[in-house]
Amino acid sequence: EEELQVIQPEKSVSVAAGDSATLNCTVTSLIPVGPIQWFRGAGPGRELIYHQKEGHFPRVTSVSESTKRNNMDFSIHISNITPADAGTYYCVKFRKGSPDVEVKSGAGTELSVRAKPSAPVVSGPAVRATAEHTVSFTCESHGFSPRDITLKWFKNGNELSDFQTNVDPAGKSVSYSIRSTARVVLTRRDVHSQVICEVAHVTLQGDPLRGTANLSEAIRVPPFLEVTQQSMRADNQVNVTCQVTKFYPQRLQLTWLENGNVSRTEMASALPENKDGTYNWTSWLLVNVSAHRDDVKLTCQVEHDGQPAVNKSFSVKVSAHPKEQGSNTAAENTGTNERDYKDDDDKHHHHHH
């Protein structure tokens, strides 16, 4: 009789995760009698995948009926493939004995598992930065195979070039992870901007996965301050206005100081949004000049988003206003937020990130 050969016709087989894999193996002779075993890997550490004679292999079935007369087909079917199943599989013929003795191995079939990358997760900086500063965004995706993968960054649809990408591990693995860090220069107009991380992989059939981050989470647009005196009101009252404009985020505290003493503190809330995503706020103070002998120094102090306070001062000239007899107190009205509400919905409008 001819010498037995173990034939594994496919050098490699590629399967999508979740699918089934068929690993083919035929022998050329019924001699010697003995079982076929399938192993993943070679050498002493090889892992038994299927044993024709004994054992329980719930995910593995023989393709042909092993009890069939003259059976020389020992192909197997592995169900519900995962990336952990990747490797080289060997069909090995044994001679019956106590124990069975290995006779010949097939050349091996490499099983590669095509696994989709996880949805990219984009994370931004831990602290906000202001315009003209560079911030870093990180994109991560895991669990894909094969290793080849393409990652691109976009800001508002425009592709970015300043990024660094790593795929790990560098060597052979059942699955891989990608991590990319992009550097983005902020502008004052970026409150509504978005960065997108786009991952393309063979398993995605040309339909890349995207992860996004809003620059509104990363940016701080400091306010402009302007203090002005409105036209003289009756009863020797001067209306001083503090306009706080173009700031983001909304978290802002405004304090009025009269000659260095706290007069009133207000917190910004439920402000309408500008088109560019920033906010404006106006606060005013009514000063009764007849209650003051000297000029009054008014200071509008703004603390924005936990940053050091910004001051803007304005002097009210008392000498320019005649005093009213018997009055020795300053009359102040509480300033209110300058709002132009169109309807109740606007009143409760919040900026969405």
Epitope: E1, L30, Q52, T67, N71
Partner: antibody, heavy 119, light 110 residues
Framework: QVQLVQSGAEVKKPGASVKVSCKAS????????INWVRQAPGQGLEWIAM????????HYNQIFKDRATLTTDTSTSTAYMELRSLRSDDTAVYYC????????????WGRGTLVTVSS | DIVLTQSPDSLAVSLGERATINCRAS??????????IFWYQQKPGQPPKLLIY???NRDSGVPDRFSGSGSGTDFTLTISSLQAEDVAVYYC????????FGQGTKLEIK
């Protein structure tokens, strides 16, 4: 290692039935045929039938086709051979044997069950 | 059905001598490039034991003094140097069709 453990000796009256069991261990029961062979006292070997436990496919010796029935219980890895309408010349040792190579041969044997048919 | 006829029915051979047992089939047992003949040894009070499969292949653990040969319809089991423990009845079996056994050959020491 492969083991086939058979049920104990039986004494039956003519016309009765006997059911011999064969419990397999040391291998995957459904992957190999089980044969049944008998041997009358001082006589040669006589093949009765074979069964594939994976799907209960059977082949019978024409001599026994109408009287013998082979079954298996895969949950307990046990094969059974029932012989009906017993006659005195059915007195024999009944062997189960496993076919390791699907060559319709008998690689591993049980120790046998003596069935005595006597009035 | 294929009928197997063994010869001789019994045989006495001296220790260390060659023993030869023949098995003739009523028609060819060759198929698919194989000769579907098997040889068994049965000692008193024991079940048979497979010695040779597919005419010429020794089963696991069988001493190499046992050999099988032949093709088509004529087959031979040879024990090259008889040992005391070889005393037994020897059966041939075919499986080109459904299994059948020869009538057996009793081997004794002369």
């Amino acid at each position: 290692q492969v083991q086939l453990v058979q049920s104990g000796a039986e004494v039956k009256k003519p016309g009765a039935s006997v059911k011999v069991s064969c419990k397999a261990s040391g291998y995957t029961f459904t992957n190999y045929w089980i044969n049944w062979v008998r041997q009358a006292p001082g006589q040669g070997l006589e093949w009765i039938a074979m069964i594939d436990p994976s799907d209960s496919e059977t082949h019978y010796n024409q001599i026994f086709k109408d009287r013998a029935t082979l079954t298996t219980d895969t949950s307990t890895s046990t094969a059974y051979m029932e012989l009906r309408s017993l006659r005195s010349d059915d007195t024999a040792v009944y062997y189960c044997a496993m076919d390791y190579g699907s060559l319709y041969a008998m690689d591993y044997w049980g120790r046998g069950t003596l069935v005595t048919v006597s009035s | 059905d294929i009928v197997l006829t063994q010869s001789p029915d019994s045989l006495a051979v001296s220790l260390g001598e060659r023993a030869t047992i023949n098995c003739r089939a009523s028609k060819s047992v060759s198929s698919s490039g194989y000769n579907w003949i098997f040889w068994y040894q049965q000692k008193p009070g024991q079940p048979p034991k497979l010695l040779i499969y597919l005419a010429s292949n020794r089963d696991s653990g069988v001493p190499d003094r046992f050999s099988g040969s032949g093709s088509g319809t004529d087959f031979t089991l040879t024990i090259s140097s008889l040992q005391a423990e070889d005393v037994a009845v020897y059966y041939c079996q075919e499986s080109r069709e459904l299994p059948t056994f020869g009538q057996g050959t009793k081997l004794e020491i002369k």
